[in-house]
Amino acid sequence: SIPWNLERITPPRYRADEYQPPDGGSLVEVYLLDTSIQSDHREIEGRVMVTDFENVPEEDGTRFHRQASKCDSHGTHLAGVVSGRDAGVAKGASMRSLRVLNCQGKGTVSGTLIGLEFIRKSQLVQPVGPLVVLLPLAGGYSRVLNAACQRLARAGVVLVTAAGNFRDDACLYSPASAPEVITVGATNAQDQPVTLGTLGTNFGRCVDLFAPGEDIIGASSDCSTCFVSQSGTSQAAAHVAGIAAMMLSAEPELTLAELRQRLIHFSAKDVINEAWFPEDQRVLTPNLVAALPPSTHENLYFQ
Amino acid sequence: GAMGQEDEDGDYEELVLALRSEEDGLAEAPEHGTTATFHRCAKDPWRLPGTYVVVLKEETHLSQSERTARRLQAQAARRGYLTKILHVFHGLLPGFLVKMSGDLLELALKLPHVDYIEEDSSVFAQ
């Protein structure tokens, strides 16, 4: 049966046994800045092009054992959530991956900046249709990372990022705090904010909306047909990147402001239990869970 | 306003140095382009001292970025410091990535075209 997260973002009219918009997002290219990925996984094979971009720091620890499957874990799962054959949101979207996170999931602001610059240069050299950039990463507040995101957004690129898994104000982290970026928090099957041990999803005025981010089934890098469940605001951001790709494929001329407005408009409202958030953050945190547009856009979204 | 004349060392007479740590992460805009500021991650464990993004003013051309980077290297060498330019940015933001001692920040902040400098820091998969 349909995984809970895909059911949650699907308008009621399309809630059949299967989530199958056959061509969702086909006009859109989604860039993923993450770990390396297993591009021959059945879920994403032929859908993800691995660029030659790589800018990562060395792994920590003298006894670190580098295993390809572990190096690829985070990125492979997210690529699957965005465009996977069976468990993806925008099954028609094509993706390009850039490696900015090492085998331990760690990167640098400078490496991310160079990655964003690479995307901008690629866009200038070979202009294509709408671009979505997924940044499933977070660091401390960074003026320069936010500025680079702003410039890329002004060039017409849609940036989607994870709010962060620190159970903290997203405004203290980047790129989550960049106003031009669509910042996504994570909710679970009960529409509650995701708890990750003592930590959990970030919140506050820098979050634009929430999306499914707990027990998300997606491609596992353990084998080319394996699946695994992962949790986090990265998974939530991947859902919104997929939804954005579907919307932009249906309406390629949408501006960032219009897209953001549509995302908010079609979200489920006031379903999140705000008691989870600190009292002073409740009024600032949007009570929105992302969803695809309803049947009025049937011909556009499910062509 | 008009920029002051460069002396042989490449410093500007009228540039004011404001070395601020911006601990709260919420930077105020620099005053009328006269003050270059320093920023670093408010979370100490995520800081990567020794690598810095030197961000230049918006309309700076690539050739000026390269020249500014070379000037920093020359001035640093005169003071006995080794530096390495790791990347020159253009296309999104003008500037460059440099590996150098934190002792050189004061010098770097006085370079022409510099808007602000940010110490590199870690980002993590979420």
């Epitope: 572990k70 331990q104 041990g197 003592t198 930590l199 | -």
Partner: antibody, heavy 122, light 110 residues
Framework: QVQLVESGGGVVQPGRSLRLSCAAS????????MHWVRQAPGKGLEWVAL????????YYADSVKGRFTISRDNSKNTLYLQMNSLRAEDTAVYYC???????????????WGHGTTVTVSS | QSVLTQPPSVSAAPGQKVTISCSGS????????VSWYQQLPGTAPKLLIY???KRPSGIPDRFSGSKSGTSATLGITGLQTGDEADYYC???????????FGTGTRVTVL
């Protein structure tokens, strides 16, 4: 609810081996780093070892390096500590503890077991 | 020998405030996140503070943490008899590539 239960402690002679286990329940075990911490009678806490959530990185205190091995079986939700060449000074209550997150091992430990006692004596 | 130094004991009357210091170096407290733990007599330790000053849910705001340079401080206000316990600071040490605990401080409520 979130729970860690240690087992495998007991009395052992110096030079012998012992394997401690820690059964985790109530949370996604594979998403968290795990620590072993010990406390000698009447003394303070001493960190012993850490393993990352996916087992890719292991760290040890100098006092146990080369003698103790930390491992995990994510399919069984179990953490292990293989203790070889035991010494009298290894006598302690051994706690397993969950790291606050998978990646941010320096955040410390947020869930602790009740401990299992290891006595090394001839 | 612990690399983090705490006072052996502190005491105060009920309702008063106590502070516990934890002194380290740049390789631990100076550049890594500090946590504080409470160990009530005969029980396992419990997390009180992480990331210098954040409290897990369920920990009252009477407990607070701060950091300055290579030292960290735990504050307990409105002291209660139930706060009688041993308190430990802890952090990663980059030089040792390991976690380190403080020497521990016994809090007594007079």
């Amino acid at each position: 609810q979130v729970q860690l239960v240690e087992s495998g402690g007991g009395v052992v002679q110096p030079g012998r081996s012992l394997r401690l286990s820690c059964a985790a329940s109530g949370f996604t075990f594979s998403s968290f780093g795990m620590h072993w911490v010990r406390q000698a009678p009447g003394k303070g806490l001493e960190w012993v070892a850490l393993i990352w959530n996916d087992g890719s990185n292991k760290y040890y205190a100098d006092s146990v390096k080369g003698r103790f091995t930390i491992s995990r079986d994510n399919s069984k939700n179990t953490l292990y500590l293989q203790m070889n060449s035991l010494r009298a000074e290894d006598t302690a209550v051994y706690y397993c503890a969950r790291a606050i997150a998978a990646l941010y091992y320096y955040y410390g430990m947020d869930v602790w077991g009740h401990g299992t006692t290891v006595t090394v004596s001839s | 020998q612990s690399v983090l130094t705490q006072p052996p004991s502190v005491s105060a009357a009920p309702g008063q405030k106590v502070t516990i210091s934890c002194s380290g170096s740049s390789s631990n407290i100076g550049n890594n996140f500090v946590s504080w733990y409470q160990q009530l007599p005969g029980t396992a330790p419990k997390l009180l503070i992480y990331d210098y000053n954040k409290r897990p849910s369920g920990i009252p705001d009477r407990f607070s943490g701060s950091k300055s340079g290579t030292s960290a401080t735990l504050g307990i206000t409105g002291l209660q008899t139930g706060d009688e316990a041993d308190y430990y600071c802890g952090t990663w040490d980059s030089s040792l590539s390991g976690y380190v605990f403080g020497t521990g401080t016994r809090v007594t409520v007079l």
